[in-house]
């Protein structure tokens, strides 16, 4: 009798352990599914937000702070105040950002469009030569690739020309103490899916 009870107890424990194992597996599976769904939701939210942003040039779903421009994976701000290269660097840092970095052709096209000025204002980029006459480096230490653009050495600058500015789509090396406008960039945050919520009463109004 005792043996049978004990055996039944063992069976119950085994069954419970099995069920616990199954439940644990189900939970893991649900967690994986949840991560995948969250990823999909994030992807869809970003795609939709980009479409909304593209249409208006602004949208509350934008992962960029108000007045900052969303391009690619980054947020940009083109400021009108003129500062030395170093002052721009510290100014951007105070804005929780870094100076403009041009990684690819599309970024150069964007920067050229945004910074173009009939009054020939130029903008500092985050490109410099820490040692005069040596290699050009971006602020984060990555080397500059000359395929991207040609740096015109500005012979009119009286002192060392170790900082790089963009002027109407052209790139010049300039004296770092010259005053130019600042461009700051920071990584775009995540699009919040809830920021895409459209109140039902606005549905069907235009496109």
């Amino acid at each position: 009798q005792y043996y049978q009870l004990s055996n039944t107890g063992q069976d119950t424990i085994s069954q419970m352990e099995e069920r616990l194992g199954n439940t644990s597996q189900e939970l893991q599976s649900l967690q994986v599914q949840n991560i995948k769904l969250a990823g999909s939701l994030q992807h869809v939210a970003e795609k939709l937000c980009r479409e909304l942003y593209n249409k208006a040039g602004a949208h509350r779903c934008s992962p960029c702070t108000e007045q900052w421009k969303w391009h690619g994976d980054n947020c940009y701000q083109f400021y009108k105040d003129s500062k030395s290269w170093e002052d721009c660097k510290y100014f951007c840092l105070s804005e929780n950002s870094t100076m403009l970095k041009i990684n690819k052709q599309e970024d150069l096209e964007f920067a050229a469009s945004q910074s173009y000025s009939e009054f020939f204002y130029s903008y500092w980029t985050g490109l410099l030569r820490p040692d005069s006459g040596k290699a050009w480096l971006w602020m984060d230490g990555t080397p500059f690739t000359s395929e991207l653009f040609h740096i015109i050495i500005d012979v009119t600058s009286p002192r060392s020309r170790d900082c790089v500015a963009i002027l109407n789509g052209m790139i010049f090396s300039k004296d770092c103490k010259e005053l130019k406008r600042c461009v700051c960039e920071r990584r775009a945050g995540m699009v919040k899916p809830e920021s895409l919520h459209v109140p039902p009463e606005t549905l069907g109004e235009g496109d």
Partner: antibody, heavy 117, light 107 residues
Amino acid sequence: QIQLVQSGSELKKPGASVKVSCKASGYTFTNFGMNWVRQAPGQGLEWMGWINTNTGEPTYADDFKGRFVFSLDTSVSTAYLQISSLKAEDTATYFCARGAPAWFTYWGQGTTVTVSS
Amino acid sequence: DIQMTQSPSSLSASVGDRVTITCRASESIYSYLAWYQQKPGKAPKFLIYNAKTLASGVPSRFSGSGSGTDFTLTISSLQPEDFATYYCQHHFGTPLTFGQGTKLEIK
């Protein structure tokens, strides 16, 4: 994907006006300028100027100052080229092209304007 | 204004040939030069900027070189789809100007 879609061909009489549209999609319209390029039949390409899509400020090449007007409707991501007091020599294909005045990665398909009495 | 002069104005070649088109600027434009390909009834297609940097999707048989005032576009081995008109264009400030074009025809 990025597209610039232009309005259809136009046949106009001398002295009339024409408005060509260029609708952009697949990117943020105000992030990139818009240029206009003319190509007369059997001829080469001529840069007419550009419009800053942020400020709406147009810039015209010398040969295109006066009768040519660039404008925008950012709410529908569209740039326009208007030509007034049309002349026979305005007969050409007009292209819009995205970007600051530099190189042009993306072009519209072109709009042929024929001016004939 | 900067004048761009292309040579030759037309050129006959065969599939597999190596072809070079030259472009000369009236003053130094450093490396601020772009190349385009245009087929009849179509918009120009962007090939190269910065004198030598290939646009994405452009076959590696196309290459650009030069700086200052003298530039070349080379097609290493002509393919049937390469027969078209080619234009150079400076992007060293405004006004932008194009070369008069080089028509590449089948021999």
